[in-house]
Amino acid sequence: MMTGTIETTGNISAEKGGSIILQCHLSSTTAQVTQVNWEQQDQLLAICNADLGWHISPSFKDRVAPGPGLGLTLQSLTVNDTGEYFCIYHTYPDGTYTGRIFLEVLESSVAEHGARFQIP
């Protein structure tokens, strides 16, 4: 039975041109994490495999950095980066868990003065 839950940073915002860390955490299970995939809609950003290390999609290699941990750092953000991101945890023996993060990339002036989503 799958007992685990994915905790994510939820809804987050960041400034255009800046960077953001996407983080998920799997809890309430003793299952072994074998691989984590990071996807934007249906597009693969990166894979972190427990045995093989990181695969960063060539399309994003110039502005995606692995980590910290199983997370992913997006750099040189553009407004087009706004949208849903998914962390897909492959585990043994549980199977697959998926978490969702919504990122809003704001124009610098808006980001400076506007409300931000905060993670408690």
Epitope: T34, Q35, L52, W54, S57, P58, K61
Partner: antibody, heavy 119, light 107 residues
């Protein structure tokens, strides 16, 4: 056009080392990981390891870990695989292969380099 | 290590035949399986990755299916250029391992 051009055939004595090169062209070298795979005569394929040309970080098959070193030269867009303490069982064709867009498979392969280990 | 078996190890077929090759894996690899074609004296060529996605430039007569531990490569109508050896490979853990191969030759 993506091309991986490997160095020529080598004949080595048992106990020696061999270094095979793989020159990449037709794409941004640092954006794609590189794998090395070998194939003994009449046998199947055996994965040796992979490297990130950007960072130089590598992962190896435990079977070869103490004997293989994979490196890159970013300036010349060339990957290298060095295998030490050669024995007759290392006689094989050695391939470099570019990692694909969506994971740890290989989408383009070099032409292969034959390494013969014989006394 | 993840073990890979292929069946059959060899088969004889005629041009126009439908050919199916099976790859069985020792543990769940989800859909992280690739298929390669190799002709004598040549390098392997990628056909399929992620179990069912056709690589660029590969004819549509090739198709892949399966997930978990059981996978198949199907050639819907065998062509003269398809006579070769086919290998499956998981792309899920270290070491990446290949199946022993299936040789497809002319009947």
């Amino acid at each position: 056009e993506v091309q991986l051009v490997q160095s020529g055939a080598e004949v080595k004595k048992p106990g020696a080392s061999v270094k095979v090169s793989c020159k990449a062209s037709g794409y941004t070298f640092t954006n794609y990981y590189m794998h090395w795979v070998r194939q003994a005569p009449g046998q199947g394929l055996e994965w040796m390891g992979r490297i990130d040309p950007d960072s130089g970080g590598s992962k190896y098959n435990e079977k070869f870990k103490s004997r293989v070193t994979i490196t890159v030269d970013k300036l010349s867009s060339t990957a290298y695989m060095e295998l030490s303490s050669l024995r007759s069982e290392d006689t094989a064709v050695y391939y470099c292969a570019r990692e694909g867009h969506y994971g740890f498979y290989s989408d383009y392969w070099g032409q292969g380099t034959t390494v013969t280990v014989s006394s | 290590d993840i073990q890979m078996t292929q069946s059959p190890s060899s088969l004889s077929a005629s041009v126009g035949d439908r050919v199916t090759i099976t790859c069985r894996v020792s543990e769940n690899i989800y859909s992280y399986l690739a298929w390669y074609q190799q002709k004598p004296g040549k390098s392997p060529k990628l056909l399929v990755y992620n179990a069912k996605t056709l690589a660029e430039g590969v004819p549509s007569r090739f198709s892949g299916s399966g997930s978990g531990t059981d996978f198949t490569l199907t050639i819907s109508s065998l062509q003269p250029e398809d006579f070769a050896t086919y290998y499956c490979q998981h792309h899920y853990g270290n070491p990446l391992t290949f199946g022993p191969g299936t040789k497809v030759d002319i009947k």
